[in-house]
Interface confidence: medium
């Protein structure tokens, strides 16, 4: 199948293409004679001296020293098979279904799968990961403790782009009207700390109160926002006079 062994082209002697056609289009053999199915991601390619590209558009044939078992086995593509097709663009893309795909090739594969199920084709909306509004991964938990104690609330959020996390103290006025006070404000017994992670596009924030006073009792809201939306979760800090006043649920200790 290399160029120096190519005889005259005899289309009648070419092996037939699959009756249902080639999913990724057709290409020609190394001699430029017989039509054959273009190869997809992970499929064997690159046999023959001329090394005519057997890979589908958007893919390239990458030489593989070690043949991957079950992907390009000894018999996989006939003599001279020396590589596998990989996606040229190996960056994530966002599909019209809201899913982030590792590459455009995988998006195209997902689109074909969707169409084969009678669903709408998936198109590329943008390069990079899909944007998504924030969501609360781990909300803060209610805390009961005595005055003078050191307590903290934590909150873990995720979103794309990575959300901005702030803390508010919720103040409920008359007739159910509520207003929020952005923390830390001017309180010197209260500190806010925020860091990225633990996962990509996640943010974790803490409110540290030390020493705890009666004025610190109330509802604290963790609020996350990005260009796609916002999310919030809240927890209460209850200040008691003595440890024995802290209610203990059966089988668990109080959050101190």
């Amino acid at each position: 199948s290399s160029s120096d062994t190519c005889g005259p082209c005899e289309p009648a002697s070419c092996p037939p293409l699959p009756p249902l056609g080639c999913l990724l289009g057709e290409t020609r053999d190394a001699c430029g004679c017989c039509p054959m199915c273009a190869r997809g991601e992970g499929e064997p390619c690159g046999g023959g001296g001329a090394g005519r590209g057997y890979c589908a558009p958007g893919m390239e044939c990458v030489k593989s020293r070690k043949r991957r078992k079950g992907k390009a086995g000894a018999a996989a593509g006939g003599p001279g098979v020396s590589g596998v097709c990989v996606c040229k663009s190996r960056y994530p893309v966002c599909g019209s279904d809201g899913t982030t795909y590792p590459s455009g090739c995988q998006l195209r594969a997902a689109s074909q799968r969707a169409e084969s199920r009678g669903e709408k084709a998936i198109t590329q909306v943008s390069k990079g990961t899909c944007e998504q509004g924030p969501s609360i991964v781990t909300p803060p938990k209610d805390i009961w403790n005595v005055t003078g104690a050191q307590v903290y609330l934590s909150c873990e959020v995720i979103g794309i782009p990575t959300p901005v996390l702030i803390w508010n103290k919720v103040k409920r006025g008359h007739y159910g009207v509520q207003r929020t006070e952005l923390l830390p404000g001017d309180r010197d017994n209260l500190a806010i700390q925020t860091r990225g992670g633990p996962e990509k596009h996640e943010v974790t924030g803490w409110v540290l109160v030390s020493p705890l006073s009666k004025e610190d009792a109330g509802e604290y809201e963790c609020h996350a926002s990005n260009s796609q939306g916002q999310a919030s979760a809240s927890a209460k800090i209850t200040v008691v006079d003595a440890l024995h006043e802290i209610p203990v649920k059966k089988g668990e200790g109080a959050e101190l």
Partner: nanobody, 128 residues
């Protein structure tokens, strides 16, 4: 030699569901290098192609007779291909066969002659 063994057939009421399995085995048989298909053979009819899946499992194809009520899938680690059949009708009564064709190309194969290995079949009977 290569063996394909279907299972999961049986008697089911109209509107019911079945999940057929096809386990492949054989020395030096690399299941993940094979495209797989399901066919059925009803008495007095030709063997009918139903659905196919590429070697990687990335692509699936369904004929109109089962589209929207069946799902083909494969587990290359278990050397098994599956066919989930839903909303079964009496006309689905047949012997169901799985078949394998060596192919590491993204293409579907729909004709009996293209497939190299066949199972013994499993009977599916749909009663009204």
């Amino acid at each position: 030699s290569v063996q394909l063994q279907e299972s999961g057939g049986g008697l089911v009421q109209t509107g019911g569901s079945l999940r057929l399995s096809c386990a492949a085995s054989g020395r030096s048989f690399t299941f993940s290098s094979y495209a797989m298909g399901w066919f059925r053979h009803a008495p007095g009819k030709e063997r009918e192609f139903l659905t196919a899946i590429t070697w990687s499992g990335d692509y699936t194809y369904y004929t109109d007779s089962v589209k929207g009520r069946s799902t083909i899938s494969r587990d290359n680690a278990k050397n098994t291909v599956y066919l989930q059949l839903n909303n079964l009708k009496p006309e689905d009564t047949a012997v169901y066969y799985c078949a394998a064709k060596f192919s590491q190309v993204s293409a579907f194969f729909a004709t009996v002659s293209e497939y190299e290995y066949w199972g013994q079949g499993t009977q599916v009977t749909v009663s009204s």
